[in-house]
Interface confidence: low
């Protein structure tokens, strides 16, 4: 099958790279400066992205894919393929329409991009709050009072979980 | 043979417009990226904008962005260089340039470009 369609179609032979050109008698020249084919038998290739601006080049365009960005330091990417940046924010705030705002109470944010998220309702499982949440931080729920022991005075609370790759503030 | 022919220059008032034209020959025209580059008398070669093979993609230099268009005719293989708001400084001689199929250099740079038309002279004055 592959043969025959080769003889049918001479950009078939076209590998990755290249492009069928029809100003030559569909010969196989290759991709100019600053574009690609990522597939065999093209009869174009594509304009590589530029990545300016807010956007750094994480990988170069090649003959064969396209360049792809990411955002510079202060920015994280949005969409897919980092379509767009957006601007960090610290730990404990949210993004809005005028900036950096921080979180209000009873709500919670530990990473540098999204929203503010409330605080788990320990109650809800029949839990006690174990460790108070912060704006940074979520609330830790304990067990219930009538899950203690009878001498249990007291609970150690754990330290305040964190992500990876989240360093303490 | 390649040939790359310029037309259009003149002398023009401060403000003015001209609008440069690179006739190729020789080859297959709708396959290359195009450059125009001027050069001001005992001034270094200078990019002004490139166009990509099938104009998907453009490059200007900041002094003239706004103010010049670079278009290309694929049917006709002839570039264009529309320049307005001309002023003193943009007098030069103007080139065109084809692009080379591979280049280890930015698009910015001579070395990025194999052919060259013979010039076409611009004079911006009062």
């Known amino acids: 099958f592959e043969r025959t369609r080769s003889l049918q179609d001479p950009c078939s032979n076209c590998p990755a790279g290249t492009f069928c050109d029809n100003n030559r008698n569909q010969i196989c020249s290759p991709c100019p400066p600053n574009s690609f084919s990522s597939a065999g038998g093209q009869r174009t290739c594509d304009i590589c992205r530029q990545c300016k601006g807010v956007f750094r080049t994480r990988k170069e365009c090649s003959s064969t894919s396209n360049a792809e960005c990411d955002c510079t330091p202060g920015f994280h990417c949005l969409g897919a393929g980092c379509s767009m940046c957006e601007q960090d924010c610290k730990q404990g705030q949210e993004l809005t329409k005028k900036g950096c705002k921080d979180c209000c109470f009873g709500t919670f944010n530990d990473q540098k991009r999204g929203i503010c998220r409330p605080w788990t309702n320990c109650s809800l499982d029949g839990k006690s709050v174990l460790v108070n949440g912060t704006k940074e931080r979520d609330v830790v729920c304990g067990p219930s009072p009538a899950d203690l022991s009878p001498g249990a005075s007291s609970v150690t609370p754990p330290a305040p979980a964190r992500e990876p790759g989240h360093s303490p503030q | 043979e390649v040939q790359l022919l310029e037309s259009g220059g003149g002398e023009v008032q401060p403000g003015g417009s001209l609008r440069l034209s690179c006739a190729a020959s020789g080859w297959a025209f709708g396959n290359y990226g195009m450059a125009w580059f001027r050069q001001a008398p005992g001034k270094e070669r200078e990019f002004i904008g490139r166009l990509a093979w099938n104009a998907g993609s453009t490059d200007y230099v900041e002094s003239v962005k706004g103010r010049f268009t670079i278009s290309r005719d694929n049917p006709k293989n002839t570039l264009y260089l529309q320049m307005s708001s001309l002023r003193a400084e943009d007098t030069a001689v103007y080139y065109c340039?084809?692009?080379?199929?591979?280049?280890?250099?930015?698009?910015?740079?001579?070395?990025?470009?194999?052919?060259w038309g013979q010039g076409t002279l611009v004079t911006v004055k009062p």
């Open positions: 340039a084809r692009q080379r199929s591979y280049s280890r250099y930015d698009i910015r740079t001579p070395q990025t470009y194999d052919y």
